[in-house]
């Protein structure tokens, strides 16, 4: 039920990568607008994206306050031009989102290989420590700051001249691997959070190869 021509939002979906978090829903509005509210399980509701015709709402600023909390959002539907109007029960029509715990559920963004440096038969590969929108003491935290040792990187590497891959793991952002002298290697990394049961792995980084710009060689 509800006000004539007003329909409740549906398919409420959290889209979140490295804590950048947007709530999406359907349908595209026809003669109606939406307002979103978000709260923690024990907290008060906070309104966002007032009377919008969009079908998404950026809730990053709210969830980064405590990424380990579990959040619930709801989307209210109002008739366009008559936002004071309520449904038959005396309340606006609304739909609840699934619960969302950013620390456990945000997708890991595609990592980037920042650099690699060869010294003799060793190569140091460094993964860029991506900045998130999570803040502490007025500074933005990196992915490593947020996840600490919970975050692992898996490195795949192979000789440019062959297809046989090797792998290494680190719970820092650096790998030190052994290579054959005089051979060029290619590298790709993947982020993993072992303790998770969902959204555990990122996609692989772009491949970077020795002999290209990111690398440095020293005897």
């Amino acid at each position: 039920s509800g006000t004539t021509n007003t329909v409740a939002a549906y398919n409420l979906t959290w889209k979140s990568t490295n804590f950048k978090t947007i709530l999406e829903w359907e349908p595209k509005p026809v003669n109606q607008v939406y307002t979103v509210q978000i709260s923690t399980k024990s907290g008060d509701w906070k309104s966002k994206c007032f009377y919008t015709t969009d079908t998404e709402c950026d809730l990053t600023d709210e969830i980064v306050k405590d990424v380990k909390q579990t959040y619930l959002a709801r989307v209210f539907s109002y008739p366009a031009g008559n936002v004071e109007s309520t449904g038959s029960a005396g309340e606006p029509l609304y739909e609840n989102s699934p619960e969302f715990t950013p620390y456990l559920e945000t997708n890991l963004g595609q990592p980037t290989i920042q650099s690699f440096e060869q010294v003799g038969t060793k190569v140091n590969v460094t993964v860029e420590d991506e900045r998130t929108l999570v803040r502490r003491n007025n500074t933005f935290l990196s992915l490593r700051d947020v996840f600490g040792k919970d975050l692992i990187y898996t490195l795949y590497y192979w000789k440019s001249s062959s297809s046989g891959k090797k792998t290494a793991k680190t719970n820092t952002n650096e790998f030190l691997i052994d290579v054959d002298k005089g051979e060029n290697y290619c590298f790709s990394v993947q982020a993993v959070i072992p303790s998770r049961t969902v959204n555990r792995k990122s996609t692989d980084s772009p491949v970077e190869c020795m002999g290209q710009e990111k690398g440095e060689f020293r005897e």
Partner: antibody
Framework: EVQLVESGGGLVQPGGSLRLSCAAS????????MHWVRQAPGKGLEWVGW????????IYDPKFQDRFTISADTSKNTAYLQMNSLRAEDTAVYYC??????????WGQGTLVTVSS | DIQMTQSPSSLSASVGDRVTITCKGS??????VSWYQQKPGKAPKLLIY???SLADGVPSRFSGSGSGTDFTLTISSLQPEDFATYYC?????????FGQGTKVEIK
Amino acid sequence: EVQLVESGGGLVQPGGSLRLSCAASGFNIKDYYMHWVRQAPGKGLEWVGWIDPENGNTIYDPKFQDRFTISADTSKNTAYLQMNSLRAEDTAVYYCARDTAAYFDYWGQGTLVTVSS
Amino acid sequence: DIQMTQSPSSLSASVGDRVTITCKGSRDTTSFVSWYQQKPGKAPKLLIYYATSLADGVPSRFSGSGSGTDFTLTISSLQPEDFATYYCLQHGESPFTFGQGTKVEIK
């Protein structure tokens, strides 16, 4: 409940081939790394290789690179070990295991492969 | 390749004894070392990961220590169900390698 069930083992002649399967239930294999580990009778554990089923990346112990191939079918939630040019010394129990990246937390019961004429 | 040299290969102990098993890597293995228990005819079971972290459901009499190249599994007070073979595994870089195993037998 997480479960790994290997199948496909049996008696094969030297030079022959065998394909082992590791059927997973209770989780999605694409979210993990999947390994094959073998154990010859009365001997220790020996790592064969791994696959990331999500992107198909495979890593092998070099001693198996030329004869063994690991693959996965995410629609069947199953990992495979294709073994070619089998030798008597490949006789072993073959286990598949799930890797969280921090540890191998679940193992199958194993399937016995016997290479003999 | 990193070799993991495990010792002793076997030991005899009594219930209540403190048992120590060591694994030495041929070079630095970072912290990706885990320990497994295997009983005859059964699959290995995870005991310790990240060299020192106790796996879920594993009794607190099991502990792991070490870093770099030297790692130790300790059973503080051996119980009847602990008679088994124990393996270390380094999985910080490929090829991943197991120690040769330590068989813990009843004295």
